[in-house]
Interface confidence: low
């Protein structure tokens, strides 16, 4: 399911996930009851077209909500996991309330207020940077745009958005905040595989689970098609067929020594002597070809106390 | 009949624990958002805890947090209260009491509880 | 939190009485008050909820009116079982915070 978040006594609509380009009517529910959510605009929450509306959020809508697109041959049921935070009491705002870094390398760049196109704002829409109001004549706001010319390092932070959606004659406040950073020019290489060592073999205890890290560096910069992953056998752990082993969901990025780094664990839960046998890639792979470390299990020999 | 009716109450020594419980019965319980209530002797009504009806969302008074806490469970029709850590202060009745709107909490209690009582002594 | 202030604390009328109570908010809630009546030893019981919508079962003597921070409960004509105490409650934001209470007694 995807995720929606908003601030508690701030508008917050979210959008149907499942709803693409459809135009047939969207029904929305509360998905641990299975009660239907009214388009009355007197409730707090309400339907409107595929949206759900709440006005204001509060700390208790937060849930899970589906969804129903009802088309004549198909129904489609999209689940929204929705968050309701309190105000942050301090100007540090969570990694939870941040929508996705804007990266900038231009002399001149614009910031987007993320998710205003739901609402029904109207200009100007304000800003602040780690919480203080944008005054310099470089920052310069345009329609749902931040735009700030002769970007340097310093300009790096939180830039918050923050606008009025008004509905049926009530104004209510909403505000997004998003990371901006500013990038040197990259470089790309070949890969290059921090861990494990080359022909590695590990050391595992039967019956016991053993977590091993695939580790590699990919030079500088946006890497385009930059992968880490496991083969067990040559085969890819999805299709290997063996639940006990899986690879961790979701690739860690690090930045180690100013370079782009990726890891991928491979898991499993309680090794057999089966596993022994096995060979394990750690492959790593960009544009400029691909490299492979392989490693064996080894049994844990018991320490010898005599 | 719309009902609830709680139980678990008594005495107990400060840092002592109990377990509280308010059967439901003439009403869609797994619907409805679930609160604790309390009322010191004497004194005002005090919001303790509430649950939502599929149990997605949880929340505390400051002056609990930590030592209560609330639950749910919808195949026996019946909301709990774990009180840990029991202070002179937690003495109360305790009312469980029904949220009127399903799912969001909006439209104030509408069904209480007649109460049970804690009294945390030495 | 929400800090809810009721008035008066206490007051004294007779039956066939008009009686006003009000309850005041730290901060505007729109119009997410309710009002509840508590009588000796009982539960409390919703009289009002929304500020202004009558609970059902209730009698049409009670009423409630306001929005934003100030909000007024009325009772036109006291009856005999209308003694009681009267709290409000914000359900705005989380905790829900009630009133400390208007005891309304005999003359």
């Known amino acids: 399911s995807k995720s929606s978040w908003g601030l508690e006594n701030e508008a917050l609509i979210v959008r149907c996930p499942q709803r693409g380009r459809s135009t047939y009517p969207v029904e929305w529910y509360y998905s641990d009851t299975n009660e239907s959510i009214p388009t009355q605009k007197r409730n707090r929450i309400f339907v409107s077209r595929d949206r759900l509306k709440f006005l204001p959020a509060r700390v208790e809508d937060s849930g899970i909500y589906a969804c129903v697109i009802r088309s004549p041959n198909l129904n489609k049921t999209g689940y929204l996991n929705v968050t309701i935070h309190k105000k942050p009491p301090s100007c540090n705002i969570p990694d939870y309330l941040m929508y996705s870094t804007v990266r900038g390398s231009d002399k001149n760049f614009k910031i987007t207020c993320p998710t205003i196109d739901l609402y029904n704002w109207t200009a100007p829409v304000q800003w602040f940077k780690n919480c203080k109001a944008l005054q310099e004549p470089r920052f310069r706001a345009h329609r749902s745009y931040l735009f700030i010319d002769n970007v340097t390092h310093d300009d790096e932070g939180d830039y918050t958005c923050q606008f009025t959606h008004a509905e049926n004659g009530t104004n209510y406040i909403v505000t997004a905040t998003r990371s901006f950073t500013v990038e040197e020019k990259g470089f790309s290489m070949f890969p290059v595989i921090t861990n494990p060592p080359y022909n590695h073999t590990m050391e595992v205890e039967i019956g016991k689970p053993a977590s091993i890290a695939c580790s590699a560096c990919f030079g500088k910069g946006s890497h385009f098609l930059a992968d880490v992953l496991w083969q067990i056998n040559k085969t890819v752990v999805g299709n290997f067929g063996e639940a006990r082993i899986q690879e961790e969901e979701g690739r860690n990025e690090s930045s180690s020594n100013d370079m782009d780094c990726l890891t991928s664990v491979l898991r499993i839960t309680g090794v057999t002597e089966k596993d022994l046998s096995l060979e394990y890639d750690c492959l790593a792979l960009n544009l400029h070809g691909m490299i492979r470390h392989t490693i064996r299990l080894r049994r844990k020999q018991p320490i010898d106390h005599r | 009949e719309v009902q609830l009716l709680e139980s678990g109450g008594g005495l107990v020594q400060p840092g002592g624990s109990l377990r509280l419980s308010c059967a439901a019965s003439g009403f869609a319980f797994s619907s409805h958002w679930m609160h604790w209530v309390r009322q010191a002797p004497g004194k005002g009504l005090e919001w303790v805890a509430t649950?939502?009806?599929?149990?997605?969302?949880?929340h505390y008074a400051d002056s609990v947090k930590g030592r209560f806490t609330i639950s749910r469970d919808n195949s026996k029709n019946t909301l709990y209260l774990q009180m840990n850590s029991l202070r002179a202060e937690d003495t109360a009745v305790y009312y469980c009491?029904?949220?009127?709107?399903?799912?969001?909490?909006?439209?104030?209690?509408?069904?209480w509880g007649k109460g049970t009582t804690v009294t945390v002594s030495s | 939190d929400i800090q809810m202030t009721q008035s008066p604390s206490s007051l004294s009328a007779s039956v066939g009485d008009r009686v006003t109570i009000t309850c005041q908010a730290s901060?505007?809630?729109?119009?997410?008050l309710n009002w509840y009546q508590q009588k000796p030893g009982k539960a409390p019981k919703l009289l009002i909820y929304k500020a202004s919508s009558l609970e059902s079962g209730v009698p049409s003597r009670f009423s409630g009116s306001g929005s934003g921070t100030d909000f007024t409960l009325t009772i036109s004509s006291l009856q005999p079982e209308d003694f009681a105490t009267y709290y409000c409650q914000q359900s705005y934001s989380t905790p829900p915070t009630f009133g400390g209470g208007t005891k309304v007694e005999i003359k």
């Open positions: 649950i939502s009806s599929g149990s997605h969302s949880i």
């Open positions: 901060q505007d809630i729109r119009n997410y």
């Open positions: 009491a029904r949220e009127a709107g399903t799912s969001y909490y909006y439209y104030g209690m509408d069904v």
